[in-house]
């Protein structure tokens, strides 16, 4: 019997046309839903002149529709057993699962400023800069909306560059019509244990972002793992949002709409600092911010973006150092809220259900030739928005999974 | 086309003034800055003034502080050197440049000015 | 102030010589180098900006490199019209300032 099971669980989590898994694979059953929280300052002016602490007040959740577009140039490569395809993004908003909506205006850092200023460091271009920031009547902070923060704007400062620059910032700009990959994954047919695990992004087995083996592509996607999770396992996996692969170990067992599943988490010890996790030497890129690489729970992706000076971290600083969110003030962690689970099927390694959450925090410093930053005293890691990505399984697919894969085993 | 085209050189006494122009075509000089550059007879090149974007601050070299002024007439898409109590060791061709980041990728043929009793 | 130290200040080469001009700042410059030629009675001609990167129009036979303190402009084959000064400037900080200048003269 119980091998019987096996073997059907292991033809059908092949990622080949006709199984049940490559179905789901394709395009997600699940609704996905992004919910945003942003980080409106209070206190603006406090900041700029006296390089007080940034008083923060979040607000949201704004909520969008996320991943429901199927993946396309699905491409089976028969010879080395792994099928290609790109993941394209696209976000609607969901109004009446949002406080407001994509017009509510929020104080936030001005990114171009905190950007420019930090790409360029030497002291005669900083000059520059200050004429263009003046020029166009720019600040350290700037009102914005929800949908331009998210989705885009022109910036009035980089606009007055002479040069053909990108002129248009946006946390997650460009977002609608573009996709994320190409993912070259293997498709179980010869090996059931490699079934989902990235062997490419991008056509490279390394990100190009990092030293040693914290560059390397490691695990599936997190939206499945291969079959038969056991509770000792610990589950890698690689999220392109945070440009690195992580992991999560087991947490508890959880029922889910009748249906046993494992709850993976992720550790405070990925977050760790070399200190304390060794492993982590590799994530910490300089010396400055990071007090030595002594810091922990913010991880600089500048390297992946372009330069700008992008900090991610768990929302509200969880498990992260105290000297980070020292000059923040309005910030409360917690576990539950806060932390990044995921409850895998364990017999069919798929996510059934998850919760990512991750914030989005832009470094700015003093510069002593850019008059808006010229008063303060201090680097600041400024919170600009956490998010919340969340999937569970439907109903419907629940009693299907129920009916076919976990009653047949009971 | 980008120009930049020189111009108020001359001869002149120590102590005296010289207002050195710089008309600029194909580009604005707004957008850019000005910066005049100079070289005194078979010496090498001396950056002497700026003046920053969207009539921005002016900075100048120490050897000229006090002496000299850049400014720029907007309209008129002209910057300008005005160069008060020169002395011998002023004597060079003087250079507009155009520059954003700090190099210079266009430059004005030159005017000379002599400073000598 | 950051001063550009050029050498040699002069040299002699032939037609079709690999020829290299090296730059030394006083201080880290990264990489905002930039590289000029200069005939006589013209006005200076960008070659070459950040160190490294090809000013449009300048033929490929023209290369710089270097980052931080050390700077290099190297002619691959030397052609009659380089016979000229060469000059190196930073632009990292105010005030910009250039090297001495190398006059490269025919043997």
């Known amino acids: 019997g119980d091998l019987l099971i096996q073997k059907t669980i292991k033809k059908q989590v092949v990622l080949e046309e006709g199984t049940i898994a490559f179905k789901n694979w394709v395009k997600t059953g699940t609704e996905v839903y992004r919910q945003f929280w942003i980080f409106d300052v209070q206190n603006p002016q406090e900041v700029m002149m006296n390089s007080s602490n940034i008083q923060v007040k979040q607000r949201g959740p704004y909520t969008y529709r996320v991943r429901f577009l199927a993946k396309e140039n699905v491409t089976q490569d028969a010879e080395d057993n792994t099928v290609s395809f790109l993941q394209p993004n696209g976000a609607i908003f969901e109004p009446s699962l949002s406080v407001g909506t994509e017009a509510d205006n929020f104080t936030v850092l001005n990114l171009a400023v905190a950007a420019a200023s930090h790409i360029y460091q030497n002291q005669f271009v900083q000059m520059i800069l200050n004429s263009l920031i003046n020029k166009s009547k720019s600040s350290m902070f700037q009102v914005r909306t929800l949908r331009e923060l998210l989705w885009g704007y022109r910036d009035p400062f980089l606009s007055l560059v002479p040069y053909p620059v990108t002129t248009t910032v946006g946390l997650f700009y460009p977002y609608n019509n573009t996709a994320d990959g190409v993912y070259k994954v293997f498709n179980g047919k010869d090996n059931i244990s490699k079934v989902a695990i990235i062997d490419t992004y991008k056509g490279k087995r390394n990100l190009s972002y990092w030293e040693s083996h914290c560059d390397m592509i490691n695990g599936t996607d997190a939206a499945s793992f291969p079959p038969f999770v056991e509770k000792s396992q610990v589950l890698q996996f690689f999220s392109s949002d945070i440009c690195r692969s992580i992991y999560a170990v087991f947490e508890s067992d959880v029922n889910l709409k009748g249906i046993p599943v494992y709850r993976f988490v992720l550790p405070s010890k990925a977050f760790a600092s070399p200190v304390e996790n060794p492993d982590n030497y590799c994530f910490c890129t300089e010396k400055i911010i990071s007090k030595n690489c002594t810091s922990y729970g913010v991880l600089d992706i500048s390297k992946c973006k372009e330069g700008r000076p992008v900090y991610i971290s768990l929302p509200h600083f969880l498990y992260a150092s105290p000297d980070v969110s020292e000059p923040i003030d309005g910030l409360n962690p917690n576990e539950e809220e806060h932390r990044t689970y995921l409850d895998i099927e364990p017999i069919t390694g798929f996510t059934l259900q998850f919760a990512k959450r991750l914030q989005v925090n832009l470094l700015v410093k003093p510069s002593e030739k850019i008059q808006v930053l010229k008063n303060l005293k201090r680097n600041y890691i400024v919170p600009i928005l956490w998010l919340n990505e969340t999937g569970t399984i439907g109903d419907e697919k629940a009693n299907m999974f129920r009916s076919q894969v976990t009653g047949k085993i009971n | 086309e980008v120009q930049l085209v020189e111009s108020g050189g001359g001869l002149v006494q120590p102590g005296g003034s010289l207002r050195l122009s710089c008309a600029a075509s194909?580009?604005?000089?707004?957008?850019?800055?000005i910066h005049w550059v100079r070289q005194a007879p078979g010496k090498g090149l001396e950056w002497v003034a700026w003046?920053?974007?969207?009539?921005?601050?002016?900075y100048y070299a120490d050897s000229v502080k006090g002496r000299f002024t850049i400014s720029a007439d907007t309209s008129k898409n002209t910057a300008y050197l005005q160069m008060n109590s020169l002395r011998a060791e002023d004597t060079a061709v003087y250079y507009c440049?155009?520059?954003?980041?700090?190099?210079?990728?266009?430059w004005g043929q030159g005017t000379l000015v002599t400073v000598s009793s | 102030d950051i001063q550009m130290t050029q050498s040699p200040s002069s040299l002699s080469a032939s037609v079709g010589d690999r020829v290299t001009i090296t730059c030394r700042a006083s201080?880290?410059?990264?990489?905002?180098v930039a590289w000029y030629q200069q005939k006589p009675g013209k006005a200076p001609k960008l070659l070459i900006s950040?160190?490294?990167s090809l000013y449009s129009g300048v033929p490929s036979r023209f290369s710089g490199s270097g980052s931080g303190t050390d700077f290099t402009l190297t002619i691959s084959s030397l052609q009659p019209e380089d016979f000229a000064t060469y000059y190196c400037?930073?632009?990292?900080?105010?005030?910009?300032?250039f090297g001495q200048g190398t006059k490269v003269e025919i043997k």
């Open positions: 440049a155009r520059s954003f980041f700090g190099y210079f990728d266009y």
């Open positions: 194909g580009f604005t000089i707004a957008a850019f800055g």
């Open positions: 003046i920053a974007p969207y009539g921005g601050d002016t």
């Open positions: 201080q880290d410059v990264s990489n905002w």
């Open positions: 950040y160190a490294t």
């Open positions: 400037q930073q632009h990292s900080n105010a005030p910009l300032t």
